[in-house]
């Protein structure tokens, strides 16, 4: 959601005022922020604090293990994507506080929101990659034993980042700053100019590749994983079920508003009442999607405590146990109970 006609995440619309107070500048922005914007600011603040600290801790824990542990590679990449996204939050926060004025210049308008998108999609696609890995661990253990190496994991991560970059290119290319209103306010957004079809195409691709496809992958992967693990009684089913439900539900819940409003706005006439309503909710939808950037460290901690009862362990130690245990066992034909438990813990990142 980042076009001028549906000005996002960083650019609002201002209430029409056709009556003028001639003694003061005609500022289309009231002094008070809208309720959705205030909620967005609260969410951004919480996500920034939890996300930066939590993901920095995850990066620190996994970075040392990434050379020898494949799961550490997954979680390192995921944490880096989330961490970078969180670093951009103060900029969004500042913009909303200033009633969606963009004081950071043209270059920042092109780079920063695009960087945010890059990291958001990198996160989603990395989650899909991890899900595929989970699937292979359960259904192709011999293949995993033979071919599942750090090199392949890094290649998979590179593909995920590359695809995320491709998804971000349209936003970067068409992003411009412009000034409007009295007193003038700088807005930052995507300008597809006269090409409505291109705008819709970008929105559809974003919905399909950035949401529907990963969601479908997750659902199918975890359905099969659950069926297999239950049938072999290899793990504590209720806890595994809770983990999988939490993973899929959090992904679906936090991204759904952003994606649905984005696709609706690309098809709606900008002057329609529905469009204007969605535009007012835009910052809130973006902030809601941003919860994804801080939720993973929380899940890791909960997983570490819930599955292993590591309440007395230090946070880095707890995270290390959750994030860096290897899932592939040396025996080629079966999983041990501890391995599947470990896998269940790790799937909570998704």
């Amino acid at each position: 959601m980042d076009s001028f006609n549906y000005t996002t995440p960083d650019y609002g619309h201002y209430d029409d005022k056709d009556t003028l107070d001639l003694n003061t500048p005609v500022d289309k922005t009231s002094n008070t922020l809208r309720v959705p914007d205030i909620l967005a600011l609260v969410i951004f603040a919480v996500v920034f604090l939890v996300g930066v600290l939590g993901n920095a801790l995850v990066v620190w824990v996994t970075a040392f293990e990434a050379k020898r542990t494949i799961n550490a590679i997954w979680f390192l990449n995921l944490a880096v994507a989330d961490f970078l996204s969180c670093l951009a939050l103060p900029i969004l926060f500042t913009s909303i506080v200033q009633h969606h004025h963009w004081p950071f210049g043209g270059a920042a308008c092109s780079i920063l929101p695009s960087l945010i998108l890059l990291n958001m999609y990198a996160s989603i696609l990395l989650l899909a990659t991890i899900s595929a890995d989970r699937f292979l661990l359960v259904f192709k253990p011999i293949w995993c034993q033979n071919f599942r190496g750090a090199g392949l994991a890094w290649i998979a991560c590179a593909v995920a980042w590359g695809l995320a970059l491709l998804l971000t290119i349209p936003s970067f290319l068409y992003r411009v700053v412009r000034e409007e209103y009295f007193p003038p306010k700088v807005l930052c957004g995507v300008d597809y100019s006269h090409d409505k079809r291109r705008e819709r195409a970008v929105a559809i691709v974003r919905l399909v590749l950035g949401f529907l496809w990963p969601l479908l992958t997750l659902t199918i992967c975890y359905t099969f994983i659950l069926l297999r693990t239950w049938s072999r009684r290899a793990t504590r089913s209720t806890k595994t079920l809770k983990v999988v439900v939490a993973v899929v539900a959090s992904f679906f819940i936090f991204w759904l508003p952003y994606q649905v409003t984005g696709i609706m706005m690309s098809f709606l006439e900008p002057s329609s009442p529905t469009f204007l309503l969605l535009k007012k909710l835009d910052s809130l939808c973006v902030s809601f999607a941003y919860i994804n950037c801080c939720i993973n460290p929380i899940i890791y901690v909960v997983a570490g405590q819930g599955f292993q009862g590591r309440l007395r362990k230090s946070l880095p130690s707890l995270l290390r146990n959750v994030l860096t245990e290897e899932s592939v066992v040396r025996e080629s034909k079966s999983f041990t109970r501890s391995t599947v438990d470990t896998m269940a813990q790790k799937t909570q990142a998704v």
């Epitope: 076009s3 001028f4 006609n5 000005t7 619309h13 201002y14 209430d15 029409d16 005022k17 056709d18 003028l20 500048p25 005609v26 289309k28 200033q98 004025h101 004081p103 411009v176 700053v177 412009r178 000034e179 409007e180 209103y181 009295f182 007193p183 003038p184 306010k185 700088v186 300008d191 597809y192 100019s193 006269h194 409505k196 900008p270 002057s271």
Partner: antibody, heavy 118, light 112 residues
């Protein structure tokens, strides 16, 4: 390329209303605002009002009671309507695009010459 | 309303001469939010639509010859033509866009 083409009547009866359509090409009305400016014979430029990309409007206080600006984004058209015209409303009426920066009018229509006379 | 005052109202010049015209506003056009001055200069030749020359008080519009220079801040602004060409003979308007829009009365540039 960017163009603004104006269409409207050349002659208007006193107390009647004036309607001018500004049809734009080369840019989208969802991304740019459009201003209306007039120039009376032998006089300077006078700003009348603007419709912003989001659809909100601002008017010159002297015309607020009888001026209306609207648009149709899908048809790339901006509509200007002024009521209760008098002889001193005789002027050339321009539509102009609000540029990306500085709230400056970077492209102008060719102008519509309007005479108010019975 | 912000009132814009231009001086002189007309100016007789010879080709190659340096020309300076002034524009004053009744209140500051400097935005504390963007740190820009919302003053623009336009050129209008007889029978033509106005043409944007300068915005933000000193930023030349693309395609405008570099002999045109805008300067000033707050309430006092100047348009300078370093070496007048015959095609520069026109009426020059300043315009504020900080609080609504107001044009100056114009400065007519004519041949001596």
């Amino acid at each position: 390329q960017v163009q603004l083409k104006q269409s409207g009547p050349g002659l208007v009866q006193p107390s009647q209303s004036l309607s001018i359509t500004c049809t734009v090409s080369g840019f989208s009305l969802t991304s740019y605002g459009v201003h209306w400016v007039r120039q009376s014979p032998g006089k300077g430029l006078e700003w009348l009002g603007v419709i912003w990309s989001g659809g909100s409007t601002d008017y010159n206080a002297a015309f607020i009671s009888r001026l209306s600006i609207s648009k149709d984004n899908s048809k790339s058209q901006v509509f200007f309507k002024m009521n209760s015209l008098q002889a001193d409303d005789t002027a050339i009426y321009y539509c102009a695009r609000n540029g990306l920066l500085g709230n400056a009018m970077d492209y102008w229509g060719q102008g519509t010459s309007v005479t108010v006379s019975s | 309303d912000i009132v814009m005052s231009q001086s002189p109202s007309s100016l007789a010049v010879s080709a190659g001469e340096k020309v300076t015209m002034s524009c004053k506003s009744s209140q500051s056009l400097l935005s504390s939010r963007t740190r820009k001055n919302y003053l623009a200069w336009y050129q209008q030749k007889p029978g033509q639509s106005p043409k944007l020359l300068i915005y933000w008080a000193s930023t030349r519009e693309s395609g405008v010859p570099d002999r045109f220079t805008g300067s000033g801040s707050g309430t006092d602004f100047t348009l300078t033509i370093s070496s007048v060409q015959t095609e520069d003979l026109a009426v020059y308007y300043c315009k504020q866009s900080y609080n609504l829009l107001t044009f100056g009365a114009g400065t007519t540039l004519e041949l001596k």
